[in-house]
């Protein structure tokens, strides 16, 4: 008897990080022998949607013409063979900018730093909000992620990076959100470039720092899920 | 057209069984989800059950949840509730109404059939 | 459990727009609730009309229309007709079940 059937691939492009109003097609790509594609929503009441495949069979595309909050969320599709469905594919998280006016960005007590100083990135939004996250440009994983517990509402958070060294340099964006949907965003701060001077000393950070010291923004996943029990805003890892 | 016909209903005593059937045609049942719904003498609606497409996901109401069962046969255009354990606040008249293809492109609880009325009484 | 309210009556006149509103007992409604909404008419003749992703079924006129208003889902009516005359019920969804609104009757006198 034949195992499982494969799980399909699922992206999304230009990416899964998308701006109010733009577009963006999902892609699943599973076999030569799919007949139909199915994209479900995580937490949704029905199927998401049904695509038959492009030829030749081994994926569809689901498009969104317009994104909007509706469309926001974690993305699973499969395909159903001849012999039935396959397993799901890995999730794809589609993430909205633009759902909330953009914050601030600034750097305490400057954003000139000396390698092996301490900054404070503060990133501060008009209204009252429960998450805020931080993104590097060009970083591997892009993404400081601060909530705050039981859903409490603050107007900033504080990212401190110390000690510095040169590969905190670089120009950063903040994001303000809604512990209700993870998945919206607001629009992006104005960037802030960190300038890293050097000194005669250049620490580099310890691969083994324990996770209570400030991690550098390009060590962190994207969208981090996990929660650990803390007053006011944390850094959560998945 | 789309209809729906529901039937099974009838007067049961509580801690007994009843399996109520929805009969569909005019539309390609093993595309949609079906769901459920109740209407109590004098109130509103209260939703049972739903059941995907395909058999493979189904949801309760917390109030019938480990008494009730939903189940379709899609060679049969037919869609079941198994009811255990009745009790009298599951008097009510019994709809099956049809669910989307999909979200993006329907609107759930769009077609109903005219209904079943169930009664527990001893 | 969550409760789902709306306004137990309502009274309009031909042409006039009215709204109905829907509100969920555990906070803000939201696009996740998938707000759906079903006309009763006499004899117990249900059908859906607006729901999915502002999906409005098929033969719907577009004088229906579906949102969320502050909290709240709404249902507006942009020039009631005498024949709208019915009972309005809204359904949310909550991660993996249904809850139906009381219902609002709506005269058009």
């Known amino acids: 008897q034949a195992g499982p059937l494969p799980k399909p691939t699922l992206w999304a492009e230009p990416g899964s990080v998308i701006s109010w109003g733009n577009s963006v097609t999902i892609w699943c790509q599973g076999t030569l022998e799919a007949r139909e594609y199915r994209l479900d929503k995580e937490e949704s009441p029905a199927p998401w949607d049904r695509q038959n495949p492009l030829e030749p069979k081994n994926k569809a595309r689901f498009s969104i013409p317009s994104m909007t909050e509706d469309y926001a969320g974690r993305y699973r599709c499969y395909y159903r063979s001849p012999v039935g469905w396959s397993q799901p594919s890995d999730p794809l998280e589609l993430v909205m900018t633009g759902a909330y006016s953009k914050p601030t960005l600034s750097a305490l007590p400057s954003p000139l730093v000396t390698s092996g100083k301490s900054v404070t990135l503060l990133c501060q939004s008009r209204s009252p909000m429960d998450t805020f996250l931080l993104i590097k440009e060009r970083a591997a994983h892009p993404l400081l992620h601060l909530r705050s517990e039981h859903g409490a509402q603050q107007h900033q958070a504080e990212f401190p990076m110390s000690p510095v060294t040169s590969v905190h340099g670089g120009t950063y964006r903040c994001f303000s959100s809604h512990g209700f949907s993870h998945y919206l965003l607001s629009h992006p701060s104005d960037p802030l470039e960190l300038i890293v001077s050097g000194s005669l000393e250049d620490p580099r950070p310890s691969p083994t720092r324990s996770v209570s010291t400030a991690a550098g923004p390009e060590d962190q996943p994207l969208m981090p899920t996990g929660s650990v029990p803390h007053s006011g805003l944390r850094r959560h890892w998945e | 057209q789309v209809q729906l016909v529901e039937s099974g209903g009838g007067v049961v005593q509580p801690g007994r069984s009843l399996r109520l059937s929805c009969a569909a045609s005019g539309f390609t049942f093993s595309n949609y989800g079906i769901h459920w719904v109740r209407q109590a003498p004098g109130k509103g609606l209260e939703w049972v059950a739903v059941i995907w497409f395909d058999g493979n996901n189904k949801y309760y109401a917390d109030s019938v949840k480990g008494r009730f069962t939903i189940s379709r046969d899609n060679s049969k255009n037919t869609l079941y509730l198994q009811m255990n354990s009745l009790r009298a606040e599951d008097t009510a008249v019994y709809y099956c109404?049809?669910?989307?293809?999909?979200?993006?492109?329907?609107?759930?609880?769009?077609?109903w059939g005219q209904g079943t009325l169930v009664t527990v009484s001893s | 459990d969550a409760v789902v309210t709306q306004e137990s009556a309502l009274t309009t006149s031909p042409g006039e727009t009215v709204t109905v509103t829907c509100r969920s007992s555990t906070g803000a409604v939201t696009t996740s609730n998938y707000a759906n909404w079903v006309q009763e008419k006499p004899d117990h003749l249900f059908t859906g009309l607006i729901g999915g992703i502002n999906n409005r079924a098929p033969g719907v006129p577009a004088r229906f229309s579906g949102s969320l208003i502050g909290d709240k889902a709404a249902l507006t009516i942009t020039g009631a007709q005498t024949e709208d005359e019915a009972i309005y019920f809204c359904?949310?969804?909550?991660?993996?079940?249904?809850?139906f609104g009381g219902g609002t009757k709506l005269t058009v006198l």
């Open positions: 109404a049809r669910d989307v293809i999909t979200l993006v492109r329907g609107v759930p609880f769009d077609y």
């Open positions: 359904a949310l969804w909550y991660s993996n079940h249904w809850v």
